[in-house]
């Protein structure tokens, strides 16, 4: 039960995280005009990865896309790439994890396959989360650098009466959404990896313990596997489903001295 819960929760957390990464990538508020210690303007500027916007006092908002690829800063391109890679990996991870979920049965998929898929999706979520966190952090670092540069020469001009006020930008809402979303995706991925360990069948074939009772040779295998008569069959530790509603997460019954006839 704990494994299913961990896997399910990991999936949900990752799903929320990836939705957040997508939202952050699409948001226009990656950087917003710094209002502190600045001349009060009747317009508010904010910028995203894809366009920059201006909101006037009336609420009228005008956005302009960055219709150039080569003219954009390399750092911005890198952030875009990291976020897109994060989204793509996350989306693939989600797709893989759906089929890996224990509560979903697809044909006669073995537990080892589900475990591998869970691990794969978990790793994808971890990398996706790291990409998002890296992307947001790179952008934040870029903002901090530019902020102090523009503070150093906030008023640029010809030294005369005419001055140009540089617009300073600070962290926008998208950065916080990105950090949280990346973190959630990362946590979800770790949970999937943990769930994978619980899903994977034991590698070692347990030595069958034979009990000699009134001439019958009955081998018991630990771990909730059905006992096989003799040593010939079921030696590969394959689960034999008995059609009941039991899950593998149920308390496993190990042979006790009262088990044999």
């Amino acid at each position: 039960m704990a494994v299913t819960a961990c896997q399910g929760l990991g999936f949900v957390v990752s799903l929320i995280g990836i939705a957040g990464i997508i939202a952050a990538t699409c948001m226009d508020q990656w950087s917003t005009q710094d209002l502190y210690n600045n001349p009060v303007t009747a317009v508010f500027n904010y910028q995203g990865l894809w366009r920059s916007c201006v909101r006037e006092s009336s609420g009228f908002t005008e956005c302009r896309g960055y219709f150039t690829l080569l003219g954009l800063p390399a750092m911005l391109q890198a952030v875009r790439a990291l976020m897109i890679v994060g989204i793509v990996l996350g989306a693939i991870g989600l797709l893989v994890s759906i089929f890996a979920l224990k509560c979903i049965r697809i044909g006669s998929m073995e537990d080892s396959a589900k475990a591998n898929m869970t691990l794969t999706s978990g790793i994808m979520f971890i990398v996706s989360g790291l990409c998002a966190i890296a992307g947001v952090s790179v952008f934040a670092n870029m903002l901090v650098t530019n902020f102090w540069m523009s503070t150093a020469n906030m008023y640029t001009g010809m030294g005369g009466m005419v001055q140009t006020v540089q617009t300073r930008y600070t962290f926008g809402a998208a950065l916080f959404v990105g950090w949280v979303a990346g973190g959630l995706t990362l946590i979800g991925g770790v949970m999937m990896c943990i769930a994978c360990r619980g899903l994977a069948p034991e590698e070692t074939n347990y030595k069958a313990v034979s009990y000699h009772a009134s001439g019958h040779s009955v081998a018991y295998k630990p771990g909730g596997f059905k006992a096989s008569t003799g040593f010939g069959s079921n030696t590969k530790n394959k689960k034999i489903y008995d059609g009941g509603a039991r899950t593998e997460d149920e308390v496993q019954s190990y042979p006790s001295k009262h088990d044999y006839v």
Epitope: V43, V54, E62
Partner: antibody, heavy 119, light 113 residues
Framework: DVQLVESGGGLVQPGGSRKLSCAAS????????MHWVRQAPEKGLEWVAY????????YYPDTVKGRFTVSRDNPKNTLFLQMTSLRSEDTAMYYC????????????WGQGTSVTVSS | DIVMTQSPSSLTVTAGEKVTMSCKSS????????????LTWYQQKPGQPPKLLIY???TRESGVPDRFTGSGSGTDFTLTISSVQAEDLAVYYC?????????FGTGTKLELR
């Protein structure tokens, strides 16, 4: 058709108070920011106050800050300007002005109400 | 505060003449975010409230005759009337609508010869 009608002007003693009103019609008052602008006799225009549509943002120039208070009653489509500690330099025609939908412009002006501060 | 300086303070013209008036601001009114200049021009006829003519330095308000043209960027702006009509006699004000406090120019009075 947009209409802005100011009222409440008149003769006031220096140090006295006055409350101006502006009745708006012909547009959705609650969706627009509003300004007060004044013009001293034979002088230029001077911006006095701004209030956003939901009253969340209010600005004044230093010349009136602490003495004038702008407010609005959206259900009644009315804009107010409470003036206290009036001085002779506050003598002017006071205009109620609507903030336009774009460009931060003052697109519609009332006819104004005259305030004279004199002893 | 932003200082708006208009010149000349008055202009005497004849009907049909081309008129140009200047407005200079102490700081740039160009917003880098949308590359728009937040400068507005108003016309005030005697005994009337001002009327909006031009916003964003060069965009004509609807209903304003096309003989009125706004130009300029940053700190230097110009209002041009291509062919002055009798009804254009008024005081023209430029206004900074970028920085608070919002400030008006001293005005340019257009008079007929």
């Amino acid at each position: 058709d947009v209409q802005l009608v100011e009222s409440g002007g008149g003769l006031v003693q220096p140090g006295g108070s006055r409350k101006l009103s502006c009745a708006a019609s012909g547009f959705t008052f609650s969706s627009f920011g509003m300004h007060w602008v004044r013009q001293a006799p034979e002088k230029g225009l001077e911006w006095v106050a701004y209030i956003s549509s939901g009253s969340s943002t209010i600005y004044y120039p230093d010349t009136v800050k602490g003495r004038f208070t702008v407010s609005r009653d959206n259900p009644k489509n009315t804009l107010f300007l409470q003036m206290t500690s009036l001085r002779s330099e506050d003598t002017a025609m006071y205009y109620c002005v609507r903030l336009g939908p774009r460009g931060n412009v003052m697109d519609h002006w009332g006819q104004g109400t005259s305030v004279t501060v004199s002893s | 505060d932003i200082v708006m300086t208009q010149s000349p303070s008055s202009l005497t013209v004849t009907a049909g003449e081309k008129v140009t008036m200047s407005c200079k601001s102490s700081q740039s009114l160009l917003n880098s975010g949308n590359q728009r200049n937040y400068l507005t021009w108003y016309q005030q006829k005697p005994g009337q409230p001002p009327k909006l003519l031009i916003y964003w330095a060069s965009t004509r308000e609807s209903g304003v005759p096309d003989r009125f043209t706004g130009s300029g960027s940053g700190t230097d702006f110009t209002l041009t009337i291509s062919s002055v009509q009798a009804e254009d006699l008024a005081v023209y004000y430029c206004q900074n609508v970028y920085f608070y406090p919002l400030t008006f120019g001293t005005g340019t009075k257009l008079e007929l010869r």
